[in-house]
Interface confidence: low
C-alpha cells in the first residue's frame, strides 16, 4: 500500500518519528507514516533522492542544497508565532554614531551569532561573497572572512585554523571560561550575544535577526548589560549602501530567511504530504494531546522533525526551492556554498596563440608558487568559438571574451560570466562607451542625423565600437537601410568614403577602403591589423586627426589616450582633447568628457566566461588574490597579469588596459553582463546577417 517514509537524523528524532507514526496510525491517518534512520540531514537528502526515503524538514541552506544538487522540492512550510509568517529577516546592525555602511565593512570588527548559523554567518558571508565584496579563494571561506574583518567573535570558530582572528572579540563567561564556545558560556553567543558584542563596543557590526535589537533594548526585562540600551542608538545597514532605523527591517535587510520546509522528490505529490501532515497537526498540535508534533521536550532535545516554535504547517504553492527560498536568500547561498572536496584542482584556461600560451604558462607557474587555488592549466584552441565549444564540452573551463563573443558564448553555448575586466578607474560602471568623434568645427558642424555623405573612420570590420554598434545604431535609427541584408553595400553607399580595415576583402566594397593608408611604404592598405595605420581605435582616431575622415567611431577613452601628451607618436604628440567633440543620439554635440550622456551604446568590458556549473566565486576568488600579487604592472612578484609586453603581444589572456578583475555581482548571465542596449545592437546586426 501507499506509505510516506520520513527520514530521521538522530535517535531522539527516530523515537519521536516512531511515536508520530503510531499516533497517526491510531487516528486512522492515511497514508501510513514510516520512519527511516539517516545519519544526518545531508544523508537523508541522499536517501530521498535514491528513493529510499520520502520526506524530511530542512532549513534554508539544506533546502538549497537538496533542490540544486538532488532535485528535491519544498511542499509544506512551517509558520512561526511571529508577524512575518513563513520567514524572518537577517539584518546587519551598527551603532548610530558610527559611519559604517555595507560598502565599508572591510576591516571593521564583526559580531556573529555563531559559526554556520543562518543569520549570523551563512546569510551575511554568502551575501558579501555573492555581491563581490568578499572574495574567496579555493573555497576557504573561513580564511576569507578572517582576512576581511578586522577581528570577529564567531562562536564555534575556536576549532578552526583562523581562531585568532575569528575569536578575537569573544570573551567567554564572567570568569573567562568558554571563550568562543558555540554555547551560552560565551557571552557573545546567539542573537542577543552578538548584539551585546556590538552594544558593548567590542564590535562595529552585528549580524542578527530583525527582532533582536527591539527585544534587547528600551528597558525590556533584560540582564544588566542591556537595561540602558535604546533602540534609537542603532541602525540597520541596507544592501544599497544606505542605513535605516531598526524598525525598517522589511525594507532594509540582507535577506529574507525562509522558514524550514518539508522537502520531497520532484515526483512526489506535495498535496498528499500536506494532507497527511495537516490531518496530523489538526489532531496533534494542541497541548495535552497524546502526541505533540511541535514539541520535543519529551525526547530531551529541541526541534525534532519540526521546529518547536512552529504554530502551523502550510502548503507551499510554488513547489520549487528557488521560489520558497526567495532571490535574496538564494543569492546568499550561492555565495556561501563551496565544497573544497568538489573543487576541481585545476582551472583550465583557453589560450589562442603562441604568445598567449607563453603568458599562460608563466601565469600558471606564478600562481602555483604563491599557492593560489585552483591551479591554472593552459589549453589551446583555434578561435574564441572553439574555446566556447571546448568549455561546453568540459574540456576547458574558462576564457576571457569580448562583448560579441560573450553574446555567442551565452546564447549558443550556455556559458556565464564569472569575473569581468575593469578598465579606467573613473569608469564606475566597468564598461566603455561607443562614441562618434568629430573635429570641433563651428563652420562645418554636422550632427548624427547628418552623417550621410560624410567620410567615416572605423577601427575595423566587426570591431564592436568601430563597426557593430555604430552600424547597428544607424540601422536601428533607420538611417542605413540594407537591401537584401547587404549591410556592407548599404554602409558603403551611406558614407562618401570610409576606412574599415578587414581581414578578408573578398567582395568588399572599395569605398570601405578608400580612406585607408596602409603602412609607411603604402603597402597592406586596409588590412585588418596594425600594418594599416588607420586600424584599431587609435588608427580610426588618427584617420580623423589627419583629416582623412569626418567622423571616427571609437571608444570613449580613445580621445584621452591619444591627446594631451598621452601618445608621443608624431601624429598625436601635439593633439588636444578640446579640439574634438562627440555626436549625440539626440542630435546635439558634446564635449568629449560627456561620453556617459552622449554615446551610441555602452559596451561591456571583457569577461571571463565559464560553464554554468562552474563556481564563479572560486574563479573570481582566484583572480582577486592573484591580482593583489600580480595585478599592478609595476609589481616585483615575477609576473604581470594585465601586461603583455614581455610576450611581444597585446591583450593576452586579459586586455592590457585592465586595472582590476571585478566580480560580476548581479550580472550573472550573458544578457545581464552585456546590457540591453548592446544586446539589442548585436541582435539588430545579426538580424541583417542573412
Amino acid at each position: 500500500g501507499m506509505e510516506v517514509r520520513w527520514c530521521a537524523t538522530s535517535d531522539p528524532e527516530q523515537h519521536k518519528c516512531g511515536n508520530m507514526s503510531e499516533a497517526f496510525r491510531e487516528a486512522g491517518i492515511q497514508p501510513s507514516l514510516l520512519c527511516v534512520r539517516g545519519t544526518s540531514a545531508d544523508h537523508c537528502v541522499q536517501l530521498i533522492a535514491a528513493q529510499e526515503a520520502d520526506a524530511i524538514t530542512l532549513d534554508g541552506g539544506a533546502i538549497y542544497e537538496a533542490g540544486k544538487e538532488h532535485g528535491l522540492k519544498p511542499v509544506v512550510g512551517e509558520v512561526y508565532d511571529q508577524e512575518v509568517g513563513t520567514s524572518y529577516y537577517a539584518v546587519a546592525v551598527v551603532r548610530r554614531s558610527s559611519h559604517v555602511t555595507i560598502d565599508t565593512l572591510k576591516g571593521v570588527k564583526s559580531c556573529h551569532t555563531g559559526i554556520n548559523r543562518t543569520v549570523g554567518w551563512n546569510v551575511p558571508v554568502g551575501y558579501l561573497v555573492e555581491s563581490g565584496r568578499l572574495s574567496v579563494m579555493g573555497c576557504d571561506v573561513l580564511k576569507a572572512v578572517s582576512d576581511y574583518f578586522g577581528g570577529s567573535c564567531v562562536p564555534g570558530a575556536g576549532e578552526t585554523s583562523y581562531s585568532e582572528s575569528l575569536c578575537r572579540l569573544c570573551r567567554g563567561d564572567s570568569s573567562g571560561e568558554g571563550v568562543c564556545d558555540k554555547s551560552p558560556l560565551e557571552r557573545y553567543y546567539d542573537y542577543s550575544g552578538a548584539f551585546r558584542c556590538l552594544a558593548e563596543g567590542a564590535g562595529d557590526v552585528a549580524f542578527v535577526k530583525h527582532s533582536t535589537v527591539l527585544e534587547n533594548t528600551d528597558g525590556k526585562t533584560l540582564p544588566s548589560w542591556g537595561q540602558a540600551l535604546l533602540s534609537q542608538d542603532f541602525e540597520l545597514l541596507c544592501r544599497d549602501g544606505s542605513r535605516a532605523d531598526v524598525t525598517e527591517w522589511r525594507q532594509c535587510h540582507l535577506a529574507r530567511v525562509p522558514a524550514h520546509a518539508v522537502v520531497v522528490r520532484a515526483d512526489t505529490d506535495g498535496g498528499l504530504i500536506f494532507r497527511l501532515l495537516n490531518e496530523g497537526q489538526r489532531l496533534f498540535s494542541h497541548e495535552g494531546s497524546s502526541f505533540q508534533m511541535f514539541s520535543s521536550e519529551a525526547y530531551g532535545q529541541k526541534d525534532l522533525l519540526f521546529k518547536d516554535s512552529t504554530s502551523e504547517l502550510v502548503p507551499i504553492a510554488t513547489q520549487t526551492y528557488e521560489a520558497w527560498l526567495g532571490h535574496e536568500y538564494l543569492h546568499a547561498m550561492k555565495g556561501l556554498l563551496c565544497d573544497p572536496n568538489r573543487l576541481p584542482p585545476y582551472l583550465r584556461w583557453c589560450v589562442l596563440s603562441t604568445p598567449e600560451i607563453q603568458k599562460c604558462g608563466d601565469m600558471a607557474v606564478a600562481f602555483r608558487r604563491q599557492r593560489l587555488k585552483p591551479e591554472i592549466q593552459c589549453v589551446s584552441a583555434k578561435s574564441p568559438q572553439h574555446c566556447m565549444e571546448r568549455i561546453q564540452a568540459e574540456q576547458v573551463d574558462a576564457v576571457t571574451l569580448s562583448g560579441e563573443d560573450i553574446y555567442t558564448a551565452g546564447k549558443t553555448y550556455g556559458l556565464v560570466p564569472a569575473a569581468g575586466e575593469h578598465y579606467a578607474p573613473e569608469d564606475s560602471s566597468n564598461s566603455y562607451y561607443v562614441v562618434a568623434v568629430v573635429r570641433r568645427d563651428s563652420s562645418h558642424a554636422f550632427t548624427l542625423d547628418e552623417l550621410r555623405g560624410k567620410r567615416s573612420c572605423h577601427a575595423g570590420f566587426g570591431s564592436p565600437a568601430g563597426w557593430d554598434v555604430p552600424v547597428g545604431a544607424l540601422i536601428q535609427r533607420g538611417f542605413i537601410r540594407p537591401k537584401d541584408c547587404d549591410v556592407l553595400t548599404a554602409v558603403s553607399e551611406f558614407f562618401n568614403a570610409s576606412c574599415v580595415p578587414v581581414n578578408n576583402p573578398k567582395n568588399y566594397p572599395s569605398s570601405l577602403c578608400a580612406l585607408c593608408v596602409g603602412d609607411e611604404q603604402g603597402r597592406n592598405k586596409c588590412v585588418g591589423n596594425s600594418q594599416e595605420r588607420y586600424y584599431g581605435y587609435r588608427g580610426a582616431f588618427r584617420c580623423l586627426v589627419e583629416n582623412a575622415g569626418d567622423v571616427a567611431f571609437v571608444r570613449h577613452t580613445t580621445v584621452f589616450d591619444n591627446t594631451n601628451g598621452h601618445n608621443s607618436e608624431p601624429w598625436a604628440a601635439e593633439l588636444r582633447s578640446e579640439d574634438y567633440e562627440l555626436l549625440c543620439p539626440n542630435g546635439a554635440r558634446a564635449e568629449v568628457s560627456q561620453f556617459a550622456a552622449c554615446n551610441l551604446a555602452q559596451i561591456p568590458p571583457h569577461a571571463v566566461m565559464v560553464r554554468p556549473d562552474t563556481n564563479i566565486f572560486t574563479v573570481y576568488g582566484l583572480l582577486d588574490k592573484a591580482q593583489d600579487l600580480f595585478g599592478d604592472d609595476h609589481n616585483k612578484n615575477g609576473f604581470k597579469m594585465f601586461d603583455s609586453s614581455n610576450y611581444h603581444g597585446q591583450d593576452l589572456l586579459f586586455k592590457d588596459a585592465t586595472v582590476r578583475a571585478v566580480p560580476v555581482g548581479e550580472k550573472t548571465t550573458y544578457r545581464g553582463w552585456l546590457g540591453l542596449d548592446y544586446v539589442a545592437a548585436l541582435e539588430g546586426m545579426s538580424s541583417q546577417q542573412c
Partner: antibody, heavy 119, light 112 residues
C-alpha cells in the same frame, strides 16, 4: 516511477528528416538531462546528444550539422530531429535520463523505437 | 572519440556460474576531478537498457548484490557472482568522463 516512451515514424525516406518524440512521465523534463542514443544493427550504440533542464543542448560532433534536440515543457516531451538521413541512420532510437544522483549515468531509458531509412 | 573495447563478444555460462566481462578504454577514464565515470548497462531481450552500476562500482537502486564492478584507469570488470536466468542479455559498458559519452560493443551473456 520514471518512464520514457519514444514515438515517431518507423520508416523514413533518404534525404528526409527523422523526427522522434520522447514522452516523460514520473519526472519533469525541467530537471536532469534528456538524451538520445541510437543502437545500430549489430549492437553498436552511439550517443547523439542531450537537452538539459535549462534548455541547453549538446550534440555529438559527428552529427552536429544534422541534429536538433528540443523540448516542450508543457507537454513534458523532448524531441529529436535528424536531417538529411541516409541508410546509415537505420537504427533503434532511445531516449534516456541522466541525473546527478547517479553521476550522470543514464538511469532510465525508453523502450526504443526502430527506424528504417529506405526509399 | 574515446574507444571502449568489450571482451568477450559472447559469454556462454551455466546458471550458478560466475561471469566476468571486461571493458578497456583507449585512454584513462579518470576525470580531472578524481572521479571515474564508467557505467554498466544490461539490455535484456525485448526490453530497454537498464543501469546496473555507475561510477565503476556503485550499484543502482534495485540491482542485486551479485553484480559488482571494479577497475581503474583504462581497465574495468563487471562480475556476476552466481548467474541467474534473468541475467541473460547484452551487457554494455559506457564512459562519460570524456565528451561525447561512448559505449562498448556489448557482451552477450547466454546459456551454454
Amino acid at each position: 516511477e520514471v518512464q520514457l516512451q519514444e514515438s515517431g515514424p518507423s520508416l523514413v525516406k533518404p534525404s528526409q528528416t527523422l523526427s522522434l518524440t520522447c514522452s516523460v512521465t514520473g519526472d519533469s523534463i525541467t530537471s536532469g538531462y534528456w538524451n538520445w542514443i541510437r543502437k545500430f544493427p549489430g549492437n553498436k550504440l552511439e550517443y547523439m546528444g542531450y537537452i538539459s533542464d535549462s534548455g541547453i543542448t549538446y550534440y555529438n560532433p559527428s552529427l552536429k550539422s544534422r541534429i536538433s534536440i528540443t523540448r516542450d515543457t508543457s507537454k513534458n516531451q523532448a524531441y529529436l530531429q535528424l536531417n538529411f538521413v541516409t541508410a546509415e541512420d537505420t537504427a533503434t532510437y532511445n531516449c534516456a535520463r541522466r541525473t546527478l544522483a547517479t553521476y550522470y549515468a543514464m538511469d532510465y531509458w525508453g523502450q526504443g523505437t526502430s527506424v528504417t531509412v529506405s526509399s | 572519440d574515446f574507444v571502449m573495447t568489450q571482451t568477450p563478444l559472447s559469454l556462454p555460462v551455466s546458471l550458478g556460474d560466475q561471469a566476468s566481462i571486461s571493458c578497456r578504454a583507449s585512454q584513462s577514464l579518470v576525470h580531472s576531478n578524481g572521479n571515474t565515470y564508467l557505467h554498466w548497462y544490461l539490455q535484456k531481450p525485448g526490453q530497454s537498457p537498464k543501469l546496473l552500476i555507475y561510477r565503476v562500482s556503485n550499484r543502482f537502486s534495485g540491482v542485486p548484490d551479485r553484480f559488482s564492478g571494479s577497475g581503474s584507469g583504462t581497465d574495468f570488470t563487471l562480475k556476476i557472482s552466481r548467474v541467474e536466468a534473468e541475467d541473460l542479455g547484452v551487457y554494455f559498458c559506457s564512459q562519460s568522463t570524456h565528451v561525447p559519452p561512448t559505449f562498448g560493443g556489448g557482451t552477450k551473456l547466454e546459456i551454454k
